[in-house]
């Protein structure tokens, strides 16, 4: 039975040209995490596999850094990076847990005026 829960940073915003850390945390389970995928709906960004280490998609290799931990750092943000990001935890014996983060990348002037999503 899957007892775990994924905690995420929820809805976040960042400035164009800046960076952001995407972070998820799996709790309430003793299941072993064997792999974590970071994805958008239509493509993989990165994978952290317990045996193979990190794989970063070539489409993102210049702008994505692994970590901290099982998280992912997105750099040199553009408005096109706005959207939904998913962390997929592959675990044994529970199975797969999925969390989602919505990122809005704001023009610097807008960000400076304090437009922010509330984190639930």
């Amino acid at each position: 039975m899957m007892t775990g829960t994924i905690e995420t940073t929820g809805n976040i915003s960042a400035e164009k040209g800046g960076s952001i850390i995407l972070q998820c945390h799996l709790s309430s389970t003793t299941a072993q995490v064997t792999q974590v995928n970071w994805e958008q709906q239509d493509q993989l960004l990165a994978i952290c596999n317990a045996d193979l280490g990190w794989h970063i998609s070539p489409s993102f290799k210049d702008r994505v850094a692994p970590g901290p931990g099982l998280g992912l750092t997105l750099q040199s943000l553009t408005v096109n990076d706005t959207g939904e990001y998913f962390c997929i935890y592959h675990t044994y014996p529970d199975g797969t847990y999925t969390g989602r983060i919505f990122l809005e990348v704001l023009e610097s002037s807008v960000a400076e005026h304090g437009a922010r999503f509330q984190i639930p």
Epitope: E39, D42, L52, H55, T98
Partner: antibody, heavy 118, light 107 residues
Framework: DVQLQESGPGLVKPSQSLSLTCTVT?????????WNWIRQFPGNKLDWMGY???????RYNPSLKSRISITRDTSKNQFFLRLNSVTTEDTATYYC???????????WGQGTLVTVSA | DIVMTQSHKFMSTSVGDRVSITCKAS??????VAWYQQKPGQSPKPLIY???YRYTGVPDRFTGSGSGTDFTFTISSVQAEDLAVYYC?????????FGGGTKLEIN
């Protein structure tokens, strides 16, 4: 239990449009996931056509981009495929399927055969 | 597009045998490969995702392995009901693409 069911005409004339409906039961298409159309040609080759997400975003196979449209009717929990300017090469069994991020296509309809012929 | 190649269109085996089906990706797809079983007259059934993870309810005689460009799907002890076509699919990036299929024939 999640179920998907394709429906639509089994015969379409060349140059016309192919229109199919996928009716989903047991899960709301606005709750989560990407809702896809996949076809299988007579030689068994499988071809992903496109999807509409729970939020209404669409993505299409570039090979079909100028001819394909996927829409939905949330009140009926249905999503639709429209393929314009069909030729005999579009003869295939058409499936609708649900995809979960980080995985493959987890639920499939039973498929509907569409023949393009004069 | 990422091309998924299943080099064997047909494989012949006997009940109780171990059989392995291979799939090669045209570029590194890490572990983002799924496997499906399609029996005659039915829609594809998902068996494996992320190269080696079985879906709930899939018998443990079915296993997947591999990473990068080379992937293997193995049935440890073939049963008569395993007569089917098996497909690999990459879920790395759109357009999501499938292998051409390997038809398992039981002697």
């Amino acid at each position: 239990d999640v179920q998907l069911q394709e429906s639509g005409p089994g015969l379409v004339k060349p140059s016309q449009s192919l229109s199919l409906t996928c009716t989903v039961t047991g899960y709301s298409i606005t709750s989560d996931y990407a809702w896809n159309w996949i076809r299988q040609f007579p030689g068994n080759k499988l071809d992903w056509m496109g999807y509409i997400t729970y939020s209404g975003d669409t993505r299409y196979n570039p090979s079909l981009k100028s001819r394909i449209s996927i829409t939905r009717d949330t009140s009926k929990n249905q999503f639709f495929l429209r393929l314009n300017s069909v030729t005999t090469e579009d003869t295939a069994t058409y499936y609708c399927a649900r995809r979960e991020v980080g995985q493959g296509f987890t639920y499939w309809g039973q498929g509907t055969l569409v023949t393009v012929s004069a | 597009d990422i091309v998924m190649t299943q080099s064997h269109k047909f494989m012949s085996t006997s009940v109780g045998d171990r059989v392995s089906i291979t799939c090669k990706a045209s570029q590194d797809v890490s572990t983002t490969v799924a496997w499906y079983q399609q029996k005659p007259g039915q829609s594809p059934k998902p068996l494996i995702y992320s190269a080696s993870y079985r879906y709930t309810g899939v018998p443990d005689r079915f296993t997947g392995s591999g990473s990068g460009t080379d992937f293997t799907f193995t049935i440890s002890s073939v049963q008569a009901e395993d007569l089917a076509v098996y497909y690999c699919q990459q879920h790395y990036s759109v357009p999501w693409t499938f292998g051409g299929g390997t038809k398992l024939e039981i002697n």
